[in-house]
């Protein structure tokens, strides 16, 4: 039962944490114009990895897109690339994970199918939300130089006379929904990771041994009520009560009185 | 078509108060209210935040001017309190639109402050 | 506060005549979000409220005759009539639309020679 809870909060703390990404990607307000000593701003400024607005007291909002690829810095490309290769995986990922799901039948798949499964969408959520989180990362890194590099420059004096202020700009929402979701992604692959671990079978030197009782037909191995992870194949040594098909949670809640060496 | 109407305007005290009306009608973006004393020029007074209530105004009003509005009435007002000789002026509600611009107004109205 | 001048504060033109007024600002209007400066002009006759004529500092108000163009960026701006016409005798004001408090220039009076 643990192994199924942990692996479906997993699926759905990275589904989550995916959806996050998704949305801080899109997201406009990734860095915003500082008002450090002007609270109330008639032209306010916001930029996303894609276009760039401006919100003017009017309500007016007014965005651009950066329709060019070559003339924007190397860095915000980076960011982009990172986010959406974390969105990508990210996606690949639960799409895995939904057919690794203990709590969805798909034909006969073996749990060690499943576990090779849920395993690799945990290493697929894992890398997601590092992606997200190095991304969101790069481009806080990028605004906290840039911000005391226009601190420095704040005015810029023409003949002593005229001054030009610069626009700082600091961190926006998109960022700290980024960093919550790549975590949350983070956490979700682990989550899965370890669920994987409850479902792999155990490798073991020792032989499987049948026992057979009047009117039962029980595999025994060693290790307990753990018998149903299997041998390498997992097809004959599995559990068998009432001839039916349980799940390895059914069969660990009815222990036999014929396990037992 | 925006239509902006001033009211309230009159002769008032040094010291007194007045309550200044606009009535707003067709689409309106943030309103603003702006003053013209006679033969001077052009003073923008106060903005209320369209989204928010929130009002702002220039250093010269703040407490003594309280820009207001009412949704229900669509009724912009400007309360002035502690008016002295100085606020003598044409009174004008303007609407903010895209650019920030002063882009529809009301006709004014003359406020004077004297004993 | 951003401080606006203009000059001349008055002029004496005749019908035809080529106009240009400035208007000078004490910090830069430019937007660097969206490359715009946020600068308008109004014309205004006496006894009536004034009227927008062009914003974003050369966009020129719908219904505004194509004879009236501004130009600059930063802090240096101009109001150009190309060709003054009757109506055109009126007081013309700049204002910054750029940061509260907005502020406006001290006018310019047009008359007629």
């Known amino acids: 039962m643990a192994v199924t809870a942990c692996q479906g909060l997993g699926f759905v703390v990275s589904l989550i944490g995916i959806a996050g990404i998704i949305a801080a990607t899109c997201m406009d307000q990734w860095s915003t114009q500082d008002l450090y000593n002007n609270p109330v701003t008639a032209v306010f400024n916001y930029q996303g990895l894609w276009r760039s607005c401006v919100r003017e007291s009017s309500g007016f909002t007014e965005c651009r897109g950066y329709f060019t690829l070559l003339g924007l810095p190397a860095m915000l490309q980076a960011v982009r690339a990172l986010m959406i290769v974390g969105i990508v995986l990210g996606a690949i990922g639960l799409l895995v994970s939904i057919f690794a799901l203990k709590c969805i039948r798909i034909g006969s798949m073996e749990d060690s199918a499943k576990a090779n499964m849920t395993l690799t969408s945990g290493i697929m959520f894992i890398v997601s939300g590092l992606c997200a989180i190095a991304g969101v990362s790069v481009f806080a890194n990028m605004l906290v130089t840039n911000f005391w590099m226009s601190t420095a420059n704040m005015y810029t004096g023409m003949g002593g006379m005229v001054q030009t202020v610069q626009t700082r700009y600091t961190f926006g929402a998109a960022l700290f929904v980024g960093w919550v979701a790549g975590g949350l992604t983070l956490i979700g692959g682990v989550m899965m990771c370890i669920a994987c671990r409850g479902l792999a079978p155990e490798e073991t030197n020792y032989k499987a041994v049948s026992y057979h009782a009047s009117g039962h037909s029980v595999a025994y191995k060693p290790g307990g009520f753990k018998a149903s992870t299997g041998f390498g194949s997992n097809t004959k040594n599995k559990k068998i009560y009432d001839g039916g098909a349980r799940t390895e949670d059914e069969v660990q809640s009815y222990p036999s009185k014929h396990d037992y060496v | 078509e925006v239509q902006l109407v001033e009211s309230g305007g009159g002769l008032v005290q040094p010291g007194g108060s007045l309550r200044l009306s606009c009535a707003v009608s067709g689409y309106t973006f943030s309103m603003n209210w702006v003053r013209q004393a006679p033969g001077k020029g052009l003073e923008w007074v106060a903005w209320i935040n369209m989204y928010t209530g929130e009002p702002t105004y220039a250093d010269d009003f703040k407490g003594r001017f309280t820009i207001s509005r009412d949704d229900s009435k669509n009724t912009l007002y400007l309360q002035m309190n502690s008016l002295r000789a100085e606020d003598t002026a044409v009174y004008y509600c303007?609407?903010?639109?895209?650019?920030?611009?002063?882009?529809?107004w009301g006709q004014g109205t003359l406020v004077t402050v004297s004993s | 506060d951003i401080q606006m001048t203009q000059s001349p504060s008055s002029l004496s033109a005749s019908v035809g005549d080529r106009v240009t007024i400035t208007c000078k600002s004490s910090?830069?209007?430019?937007?660097?979000?969206?490359?715009?400066?946020?600068l308008t002009w109004y014309q205004q006759k006496p006894g009536k409220a004034p009227k927008l004529l062009i914003y974003?500092?050369?966009t020129l108000e719908s219904g505004v005759p194509s004879r009236f163009s501004g130009s600059g960026s930063g802090t240096d701006y101009t109001l150009t009539i190309s060709s003054l016409q009757p109506e055109d005798f009126a007081t013309y004001y700049c204002q910054n639309a750029y940061s509260f408090p907005f502020t406006f220039g001290q006018g310019t009076k047009v008359e007629i020679k």
């Open positions: 303007a609407r903010l639109g895209p650019g920030n611009v002063f882009d529809y």
């Open positions: 910090q830069s209007l430019l937007n660097s979000g969206n490359q715009k400066s946020y």
């Open positions: 974003w500092a050369s």
